[in-house]
Each structure stands twice: as structure tokens, then as C-alpha cells.
């Protein structure tokens, strides 16, 4: 997260760290007791490493009573996701067992009504992604509030030049932005999960390259079918 600040500890109990061989790789969001939603491209970076999900964490390194690392029973990328595009960049991870819920571990309601968030709405994005252009990684969860940007502006030639489909949404990126390592994390508007950070190699913090988020409402049928 660029231009953000440290989150209040455990105030986002849905927040997950998707890890490979014990290292943070991507964000994720607990959407059901046994399921974490993340970005499909995160799996590509995992290679053949052991994928696990950390729940109940604020610090990645310090012991915390609520922290627990779960093995992944099944990884389900969206069937239409492709390595060369950010389309359908969603991944569902089934935990090896149901998460132990509590004040620091709790699923987040996700948007099912397929309607665009009003541009200008301030939404919260959180993650353990880099906090500087130099690539500094935080130990503790960061977050930032970002205004939603209308799709027409996001699709301008100076911005994402037509790449933003109806199944994506954008948020402003003027110095405050999601960045590398935040992919798969939640964009939360009004207490509801609206978007998932896409995992392209986008420049961060440049106002002409807004953050791109996969709209979960557009994938309600797929999410429901996997969780069923």
C-alpha cells in the first residue's frame, strides 16, 4: 500500500495473507468459514511452492494469539483467467479446515448486486504489499482509503486505454494506491467487499494508471458454485 498507514490491529478480521513457503505473496479475503478469495495470478508466482493462508494476523512476523496458518485443500482459479490478461483475475482457496472464527477472524460480506459503485465513493484497501517505490515491505498490515474512479476515465488512452471491462472497477492512484504484494486483497466499500486487487505488473502511485480491481458482484454465480 502506497501512501497509506498502519491499520488498526485486527480491525479487518477478514484479511488474509496468502503465503508460499512461509513468505507473504498476496492478499486475500475470507468470504466463508473455509474459503479465501484472492487473485488468480498469485498462483502463477507460487510455482511449486507450498501455498498456505494466514488468518488473524496484524504483524507477519510477531506472535499473536489470533494468528493461524492454514494449509490449502484446493485452489480454484477462475476458469477463464489467463496469464497474459487481468480478466477474471479471481482465485478461491479452500482451507484444509474451517477457520476458527473470533473477533480477529471473520468472513466479510461480499457484494452480490451487479451494479457499479458510485464514482467518488471512498473505499478501503488493505494489504502487506510494498509501501515504497524502493520495494520496502511492511511487517504490519497497511490500509488506505481510495475514491472509486468512473470506468470511462479509467479507459482513456492516457490511463488504461480500453482495458477496463464491465467486470472491473478502478480507484484513484494519485500517490495513494495498492501495489505489489497487495494483489488478491479486498477493496471494501461501506463494509462490503466490492473488489479484489488485480495482480498485473502495474505502476503504482501514478494518477494516470489507476488501480484495477475485479468486481466480485460480477462473479457471484461462479463464487456461489465453487462454495456450494
Amino acid at each position: 500500500i502506497l501512501g497509506g498507514r498502519e491499520a488498526e490491529a485486527h480491525a479487518r478480521p477478514y484479511m488474509a495473507s496468502v503465503q508460499v513457503n512461509g513468505e507473504h505473496l498476496c492478499g486475500g479475503v475470507l468470504v466463508a468459514e473455509q474459503w479465501v478469495l484472492s487473485a488468480a495470478h498469485c498462483l502463477e508466482d507460487a510455482a511449486d511452492g507450498k501455498v498456505q493462508v494466514l488468518l488473524g494476523a496484524h504483524s507477519l512476523s510477531q506472535p499473536e494469539p489470533s494468528k493461524r496458518l492454514y494449509d490449502v485443500l484446493r485452489a480454484v482459479p477462475h476458469p477463464d483467467s489467463r496469464p497474459d490478461t487481468i480478466d477474471h483475475d479471481l482465485l478461491l482457496l479452500q482451507l484444509s479446515e474451517k477457520a476458527t472464527l473470533g473477533p480477529a477472524v471473520r468472513p466479510l460480506p461480499w457484494q452480490r448486486v451487479d451494479r457499479d459503485v458510485e464514482p467518488g465513493t471512498l473505499c478501503d484497501v488493505a494489504g502487506w504489499g510494498i509501501v515504497s517505490h524502493a520495494g520496502r515491505r511492511p511487517d504490519r498490515l497497511q490500509h488506505v482509503l481510495l475514491p472509486v474512479l468512473d470506468r470511462a476515465t479509467c479507459n482513456r488512452r492516457t490511463h488504461h486505454d480500453g482495458a477496463i471491462t464491465q467486470r472491473m472497477m478502478c480507484a484513484e492512484s494519485n500517490r495513494r494506491d495498492s501495489c505489489k504484494g497487495d494483489s488478491g486483497g479486498p477493496l471494501v466499500c461501506g463494509g462490503v467487499l466490492e473488489g479484489v486487487v488485480t495482480s498485473g505488473s502495474r505502476v503504482c502511485g501514478n494518477r494516470k494508471k489507476p488501480g484495477i480491481y475485479t468486481r466480485v458482484a460480477s462473479y457471484a454465480a461462479w463464487i456461489d458454485s465453487v462454495l456450494a
Epitope: 464514482p119 470506468r151 470511462a152 479507459n155 488512452r157 492516457t158 490511463h159 480500453g162
Partner: antibody, heavy 115, light 107 residues
Framework: EVQLVQSGAEVKKPGASVKVSCKAS????????MYWVRQAPGQGLEWIGE????????NFNEKFKSRATLTVDTSTSTAYLELSSLRSEDTAVYYC????????WGQGTLVTVSS | DIQMTQSPSSLSASVGDRVTITCKAS??????VAWFQQKPGKAPKGLIR???SRYSGVPSRFSGSGSGTDFTLTISSLQPEDFATYYC?????????FGQGTKVEIK
């Protein structure tokens, strides 16, 4: 298939107004700005302005700001350019074009201003 | 306004020739430059965006380069269908502006 289909040719008298339409199909109309360009006979291309169909926000070339009005009807996915106080120098082909992604242009509308 | 000065204004060339058209911006426009091809009585057709990215379906003989203030469109081997007028456009700043055009004619 994306298409921008413009209204037919117009002949107007000096001082009159003209309204050119541009009907979009094959994509989500509100997801892309629409801009307008004109080309006088034998001349180059001149940018008039643009509109965000989602918000209605417009940006104009200062040269046209006082005389040009850009509007949209999202229910029919149509963009409009209205040019008032026409003079003979406004005789030109007027084009709409989608801003972003592939460079889609309308076929052009010839507006002739003659007394 | 940003002036886009295109040169030459016209050129004569033969099929198979390598053709280079240049466009100079009066101030820095990063890589926010597009190139269009226009044939008589037709709407302009996009060739290049972001100074060097070809639009899909555009033959590889068309290439663009440059950043800042100096931009080039190159046709590596001119084909009969390439005889047309070419325009550069900057979209970095309002108002968007075009070069005055380069007419490529048959020698």
C-alpha cells in the same frame, strides 16, 4: 462489432444551429469517453471536445467552447454535438470517435454552411 | 495549445520504399501520441497509440517511436494501399491537437 453511426449530411444557413448524432453499438456506451473532431474541405483534423457519457462531464477546445454543446442519451447510446451561430468556416465533415481501446470513428457527417 | 509540427507535408515514394514521417511537439507530451491514416472520403484509421504500440490488425510494417517532443512513424516497405495522408495526434494535454498531415503519394 463496435460501430459508431452518424446522422446524415446537413445544409444550414449562417447563424443557424446544427445537431449531429453519433449512435454507438457493440460496447458499453458509458465506459468510454466520446470525442468530436472536424475536418474542413482539404484541411487537417481539428479536435472540438469530448464528453464522459457516464457523468456528462465535458472538455472543450477553447475555440469552440462558446458555440459547441456536447450531450449524450445513455438510453439510446447516442452522443450529440450541437454547434450554434454557424458561419461558412464551419463547413466541414464532423466525426465522433471513441476515446480508449481500439480507435473507432464514425463515418463522418458533412455540414455545409451556405447562404 | 501544444503544436504538433509534422514533416514533410508531402512526399513521393515508390512501392517497397522505406518512409519516415516525423512529428515534433512544442512541449513534452511523454508518449501520449497516436498516428492515424486517412484515405480520401474516409474516416481516419488508428495505426499507433502510446507512440509505439500498434493497434490490432495494423500490419507490422508500420512502427512508431519517440517520447517527449520527437516522434516518428515509419513504414518499412511501402505497399500500394499505404498511399494516404498520415496525422499525428497528442492526447497528453487539452486541447488534443493534430499535426497538419503528411500526404504520401506515388512517385
Amino acid at each position: 462489432e463496435v460501430q459508431l453511426v452518424q446522422s446524415g449530411a446537413e445544409v444550414k444557413k449562417p447563424g443557424a444551429s446544427v445537431k449531429v448524432s453519433c449512435k454507438a453499438s457493440g460496447y458499453t456506451f458509458t465506459s468510454y469517453y466520446m470525442y468530436w473532431v472536424r475536418q474542413a474541405p482539404g484541411q487537417g483534423l481539428e479536435w472540438i471536445g469530448e464528453i464522459n457519457p457516464y457523468s456528462g462531464e465535458t472538455n472543450f477546445n477553447e475555440k469552440f467552447k462558446s458555440r459547441a454543446t456536447l450531450t449524450v442519451d445513455t438510453s439510446t447510446s447516442t452522443a450529440y454535438l450541437e454547434l450554434s451561430s454557424l458561419r461558412s468556416e464551419d463547413t466541414a465533415v464532423y466525426y465522433c470517435a471513441r476515446e480508449g481501446g481500439f480507435a473507432y470513428w464514425g463515418q463522418g457527417t458533412l455540414v455545409t454552411v451556405s447562404s | 495549445d501544444i503544436q504538433m509540427t509534422q514533416s514533410p507535408s508531402s512526399l513521393s515514394a515508390s512501392v517497397g520504399d522505406r518512409v519516415t514521417i516525423t512529428c515534433k511537439a512544442s512541449q513534452n507530451v511523454d508518449t501520449d501520441v497516436a498516428w492515424f491514416q486517412q484515405k480520401p472520403g474516409k474516416a481516419p484509421k488508428g495505426l499507433i497509440r502510446s507512440a509505439s504500440s500498434r493497434y490490432s490488425g495494423v500490419p507490422s510494417r508500420f512502427s512508431g517511436s519517440g517520447s517527449g517532443t520527437d516522434f516518428t512513424l515509419t513504414i518499412s516497405s511501402l505497399q500500394p494501399e499505404d498511399f494516404a495522408t498520415y496525422y499525428c495526434q497528442q492526447y497528453n494535454n487539452y486541447p488534443l491537437t493534430f499535426g497538419q498531415g503528411t500526404k504520401v503519394e506515388i512517385k
